[in-house]
Interface confidence: low
């Protein structure tokens, strides 16, 4: 028997293929800066394989290190609009459980109308990620301009 | 025999290591907004492992969910230039087969000279990705300023 | 025995889970444009699994293709500040061994206060990555605004 088989083998189901890519559903009511997301093949090219949506927020189902990425484009925006309505800021963070609440990624729009970034971060089963957009400008609902996703990378 | 071996095993060649990182070759002729890419170790740090280039456009060889990323920097550009030549927009999409044509990722430069973003998206064998740069400004061909790549993430 | 087991199996430890996410420690002394990084669970959500820090610079331990990503936000910055102090540029590159020195990723801030990007690149064991910030503005040390990481993707 080959040596490779004598080592710990990796079953397909343990690989942690957890991944999600979401599109914007709607913004929150006043005083609620959260963006509400949706996903599923019927909506276009968004999907959830592992993580789930809980009232428009993304909940993690598997412990591990994740690549979190986001792009948000402001609707009805030009560099003049963006600077006039500054500061407009996007923050991605763990919003529940409260004991693990933390901001993971934060960007301001300044004179631009789009922010895009990504980072690696440890997440635990049950962590809910929220994306807070503060300011008076609205996000574009175009699926190629505004999206949010996570990808499990390693245990 | 260990339990892990009784489960479905993952052969190395089935892991779907498909990955590509491309550098800009040239822009298209007038009325063709597409960027034309090139890749291979002889050119520097670009490469194709799985996907292929078809007349400068990236063609996918394996079905799956991919992380698509891009950075484009405009040549001879300042924030004044960028705003004067606004709108300059970059769109990444599936351009063939025509039945699957769709825009996947889109950004405007506004007062900036670089855009960079990434997203997860399902792609199928035979999908060709095109990157359309609309506007009058030209992209930088510096390999650390303009690049485009994909990475297979899961089936 | 199942066909999958007759093929080359992938032991868990050979999967190349190498990954790191770093937070800013400090900037260099004058004439040294490098950013100095730190990582580890005691510091927050940064970590090193495989790569190591060598005097604040990230050293690779496993050959392969890596996804390199970075976000840097300038401290005490507005679009006016950013344009007044232009050019402020960030470059990520291999700085040692000298024989492999190359710029991998470069962005200017123009009228923005944050840059964020990512790319795939081959790296070899012993490669040290440096992140050079040129200009007079200082980076934010907030862990959700400035971070740098790598993720092994394939051999």
């Amino acid at each position: 028997q080959r040596f490779a088989q004598a080592q710990q083998q990796l079953p397909l189901e343990s690989l942690g293929w957890d991944v999600a890519e979401l599109q914007l559903n709607h913004t929150g009511p006043q005083q609620d800066p959260r963006l509400y997301w949706q996903g599923g093949p019927a909506l276009g090219r968004s999907f959830l394989h592992g993580p789930e949506l809980d009232k428009g927020q993304l909940r993690i189902h598997r412990d591990g290190i994740y690549m979190v990425h986001i792009q948000v484009t402001l609707a009805i925006c030009s560099s003049t609009t963006a600077s006039r309505h500054h500061p407009t800021t996007l923050a991605v963070g763990i919003c529940s459980p409260a004991s693990r609440s933390i901001s993971l990624l934060r960007l301001s729009f300044h004179q631009g109308c789009t922010i895009a970034s990504q980072r690696l971060t440890p997440l635990a089963r049950g962590d809910t990620l929220c994306t807070n957009l503060t300011g008076t400008l609205l996000p574009s609902r175009n699926t190629d301009e505004t999206f949010f996703g996570v990808q499990w990378v390693r245990p | 025999q260990r339990f892990a071996q009784a489960q479905q095993q993952l052969p190395l060649e089935s892991l779907g290591w498909d990955v590509a990182e491309l550098q800009l070759n040239h822009t298209g002729p007038q009325q063709d907004p597409r960027l034309y890419w090139q890749g291979g170790p002889a050119l520097g740090r670009s490469f194709l492992h799985g996907p292929e280039l078809d007349k400068g456009q990236l063609r996918i060889h394996r079905d799956g969910i991919y992380m698509v990323h891009i950075q484009v920097t405009l040549a001879i550009c300042s924030s004044t230039t960028a705003s004067r030549h606004h709108p300059t927009t970059l769109a990444v999409g599936i351009c063939s087969p025509a039945s699957r044509s769709i825009s996947l990722l889109r950004l405007s430069f506004h007062q900036g000279c670089t855009i960079a973003s990434q997203r997860l998206t399902p792609l199928a064998r035979g999908d060709t990705l095109c990157t359309n740069l609309t506007g009058t400004l030209l992209p930088s061909r510096n390999t650390d300023e303009t690049f485009f790549g994909v990475q297979w993430v899961r089936p | 025995q199942r066909f999958a087991q007759a093929q080359q199996q992938l032991p868990l430890e050979s999967l190349g889970w190498d990954v790191a996410e770093l937070q800013l420690n400090h900037t260099g002394p004058q004439q040294d444009p490098r950013l100095y990084w730190q990582g580890g669970p005691a510091l927050g959500r940064s970590f090193l699994h495989g790569p190591e820090l060598d005097k604040g610079q990230l050293r690779i331990h496993r050959d392969g293709i890596y996804m390199v990503h970075i976000q840097v936000t300038l401290a005490i910055c507005s679009s006016t500040t950013a344009s007044r102090h232009h050019p402020t540029t960030l470059a990520v590159g291999i700085c040692s061994p000298a024989s492999r020195s190359i710029s991998l990723l470069r962005l200017s801030f123009h009228q923005g206060c944050t840059i964020a990007s990512q790319r795939l690149t081959p790296l070899a064991r012993g490669d040290t990555l440096c992140t050079n910030l040129t200009g007079t503005l200082l980076p934010s040390r907030n862990t959700d605004e400035t971070f740098f990481g790598v993720q092994w993707v394939r051999p």
């Epitope: 484009t73 009805i76 003049t80 309505h85 109308c113 400008l137 175009n142 | 999409g93 889109r106 | -």
Partner: antibody, heavy 122, light 107 residues
Framework: EVQLVESGGGLVQPGGSLRLSCAAS????????MNWVRQAPGKGLEWVSD????????YYADSVKGRFTISRDNAKNTLTLQMNSLKPEDTALYYC???????????????WGQGTQVIVAS | QSALTQPSTVSVSLGQTARITCRGD??????TNWYQQKPGQAPVLVIY???SRPSGIPERFSGSSSGATAALTISGAQAEDEGDYYC??????????FGGGTHLTVL
């Protein structure tokens, strides 16, 4: 050259239905938001509906909500407007319109068809 | 009743400057586009995002915006500029809204 050609208009009784089509050519149809805008005789322009590039998201003016359905076929480069429960006040010239694609701006209608006439009368 | 208000008519002498205004609360936040429509023809975009001119539109057309008012200015009006002009912006949902239109007469 961008071309948008509408068809399907005509005379219909109140409560009836019509299906308008728009054939697009000369541009990458699947990249753009598409819209229907109408103009009643002797009146101004009124936005009716839009659909995103994928076809998964649609929006309607309050005056047509629940009665009109916008859809698109990116493979065939066609935009359609299914109009049900038509009313006399829906009488208008219906234009197929492309949003310029700078869709992080106010919608910018840079290309218009010549329109197709819809008359709702008994 | 449109959320954007335009004068119903504006007259200008040949070669003089015409100014058409558009008022609406949404203009404080959002850009304005302007369209020209000649009898029996589809509208044509002449100004977008307050003050940008599409290629092919003569330089005599310009746009400006201040507060809740946007304006289209035609410097040195020509006979062929006669027609209807519509301003357009967006509501809070990002849906397009048009002004009621202004008929420009070149005397």
């Amino acid at each position: 050259e961008v071309q948008l050609v509408e068809s399907g208009g005509g005379l219909v009784q109140p409560g009836g239905s019509l299906r308008l089509s728009c054939a697009a050519s000369g541009f990458t149809f699947s990249v753009y938001y598409m819209n229907w805008v109408r103009q009643a005789p002797g009146k101004g322009l009124e936005w009716v509906s839009d659909i995103n590039n994928e076809g998964g998201t649609t929006y309607y003016a309050d005056s047509v909500k629940g009665r009109f359905t916008i859809s698109r076929d990116n493979a065939k480069n066609t935009l359609t407007l299914q109009m049900n429960s038509l009313k006399p006040e829906d009488t208008a010239l219906y234009y197929c319109v492309r949003d310029a694609g700078y869709s992080n701006h106010v919608p910018i209608f840079d290309s218009w068809g010549q329109g197709t006439q819809v008359i709702v009368a008994s | 009743q449109s959320a954007l208000t335009q004068p119903s008519t504006v007259s200008v002498s040949l070669g003089q400057t015409a100014r058409i205004t558009c008022r609406g609360d949404s203009l404080e936040r959002y850009g304005t586009n302007w369209y020209q429509q000649k009898p029996g023809q589809a509208p044509v975009l002449v100004i977008y995002d307050d003050d940008s001119r599409p290629s092919g539109i003569p330089e005599r057309f310009s746009g400006s915006s201040s507060g809740a008012t946007a304006a289209l200015t035609i410097s040195g009006a020509q006979a062929e500029d006669e027609g209807d002009y519509y301003c357009q912006s967006a509501d809070s949902s990002g849906n397009a809204v048009f002004g009621g239109g202004t008929h420009l007469t070149v005397l």
